[in-house]
């Protein structure tokens, strides 16, 4: 139900519930143990059996997905929206999020966003913001400072806790994940850390936090000593392939 919220954050790691909360729509932004679904009252259960990721916006989808009506490319076209696979290079697009990581939407086509090959003045404003990291600050003289475009752009990738638009904005070892009404860079999960196994059956639309994915060489699997537990309480952790 959309009145449920899945708390699922790198930030929280293995805290006992609760961290405290405040109201949210849909549902209440209640901070409970990671990977636990709050359904009002005292009822907690994990989410592992929903149909394809329902979503309302791109940030609820994975880094290789965007939110859209399944029959049309653009989000916001009537009916239910789900997370769809990103568009590869040279495919049609309407916004940056539709293009796969490493690409951006230019003139309705997904183009490679090789930071060192942007011609002067060619990058759209939102890309300039990302590359210049200007979304992280106000200038010292009290006025915001825009990044000046040169033919080569060198920038610092977002560190943990930095606001981001997609994972390519974040430094190595971090991904861009939903955090309440924003997205921030969070650590890619290490071996043994709790992860979220969505099984392509959706819960992104209910998350107010997202965890990152498991790091290289790791997969999100049921923790061995939890095999005997009921389906609704299986704990997934990042494990070696």
């Amino acid at each position: 139900t959309l009145n449920s919220v899945l708390i699922n954050s790198n930030a929280i790691k293995n805290l006992p519930p609760p961290l405290g909360g405040a109201g949210g729509q849909p549902g209440s932004a209640v901070s409970v143990a990671p990977g636990v679904l709050y359904e009002g009252g005292n009822k907690y259960q994990t989410l592992d059996n929903y149909q394809p990721y329902p979503c309302a916006e791109d940030e609820e989808c994975g880094s290789d997905e965007y939110c859209s009506s399944p029959s049309r490319g653009a989000a916001g076209v009537g009916g239910v929206q789900i997370c769809l696979a990103c568009r590869k290079r040279r495919k049609r697009c309407m916004r940056h999020a539709m293009c796969c990581p490493g690409n951006y939407c230019k003139n309705g086509i997904c183009m490679p966003s090789d930071h060192s090959h942007f011609p002067r003045g060619e990058i759209e404003e939102s890309i300039i913001e990302n590359l210049g990291n200007d979304h992280n600050a106000a200038a010292g003289d009290g006025y915001p400072r825009r990044t000046t475009l040169t033919s080569k752009i060198y920038h610092t990738k977002g560190q943990e806790g930095s606001v981001c638009l997609r994972s390519s904005d974040c430094a190595a070892g971090l991904c861009c994940a939903r955090h309440f009404w924003s997205k921030i860079c969070k650590p890619v999960l290490k071996e043994g850390q709790v992860c979220t196994k969505h099984k392509r059956k959706g819960s992104h639309g209910l998350e107010i936090f997202q965890r990152c994915y498991c790091g290289e060489g790791l997969a999100c699997r049921i923790q061995k000593d939890h095999h005997q537990a009921s389906n609704s309480s299986r704990l997934h952790t990042c494990q070696r392939h």
């Epitope: 790198n10 309302a56 916006e57 913001e129 806790g161 009404w181």
Partner: antibody
């Protein structure tokens, strides 16, 4: 450059309503979550509400839940805060700010609730 | 709610001196989801530090943030006349977002 300009503040009686607006420019508005923060005269900062880039997700402080409604019109690059059932303790300067740590702030608009 | 306690409430220093402001969280933040702001009278706050230690664009290098867990620090290495203001910390780990009560840095 990024600019946020609030408007709509003023004097209102207890129980009354006001609608604050925040006009945004200089950035891709729908890419960013937005936040309202308030500051009572001579006091510290208090988070009021937040809204995701598309407007699909909203969050409120307990002190305003059920009375205030945050919304946005991405076609107009404008953020709103509808304030109903106002109380004396809602008297404050209200700031709109971008994202969850507030990287850009408006100049603020004063809301005075008094009879 | 996570309570942030800033100390001292007031710091009286001279230009050129080093200022060390503390922000203590009532719960372990585990992650560096802490920001620092500067506010001058009659003005909106201004972001200085985010992610506990990342300096916001355009913020002078004399400002630095550090700390983790429950204890965070904002350091101004050598105070300039324009640095005398109120400083707030804010956590964005969990809701409600909370701010410290502020530290006023005043001229001695």
């Amino acid at each position: 450059q990024v600019q946020l300009v609030e408007s709509g503040g003023g004097l209102v009686q207890p129980g009354g309503s006001l609608r604050l607006s925040c006009a945004a420019s200089g950035f891709t508005f729908n890419n960013y979550g937005m936040t309202w923060v308030r500051q009572a005269p001579g006091k510290g900062l208090e988070w009021v509400s937040g809204i995701s880039g598309s407007g699909s997700y909203t969050y409120y402080a307990d002190s305003v839940k059920g009375r205030f409604t945050i919304s946005r019109d991405n076609s107009k690059n404008t953020l709103y805060l509808q304030m109903n059932s106002l109380r004396a303790e809602d008297t404050a300067v209200y700031y709109c700010a971008r994202t969850i740590y507030m990287d850009y702030w408006g100049q603020g608009t004063l809301v005075t609730v008094s009879s | 709610d996570i309570v942030l306690t800033q100390s001292p409430a007031t710091l009286s220093l001279s230009p050129g001196e080093r200022a060390t402001l503390s922000c203590r969280a009532s719960q372990n933040l585990f992650s560096p989801y802490l920001a620092w702001y500067q506010q001058k009278p009659g003005q909106a706050p201004r972001l200085l530090i985010y992610g506990a230690s990342n300096r916001a664009t355009g913020v002078p290098a004399r400002f630095s943030g550090s700390g983790s867990g429950t204890d965070f620090t904002l350091t101004i290495s050598s105070l300039e006349p324009e640095d005398f203001a109120v400083y707030y910390c804010q956590q964005y780990l969990t809701l409600p977002l909370t701010f410290g009560q502020g530290t006023k840095v005043e001229i001695k």
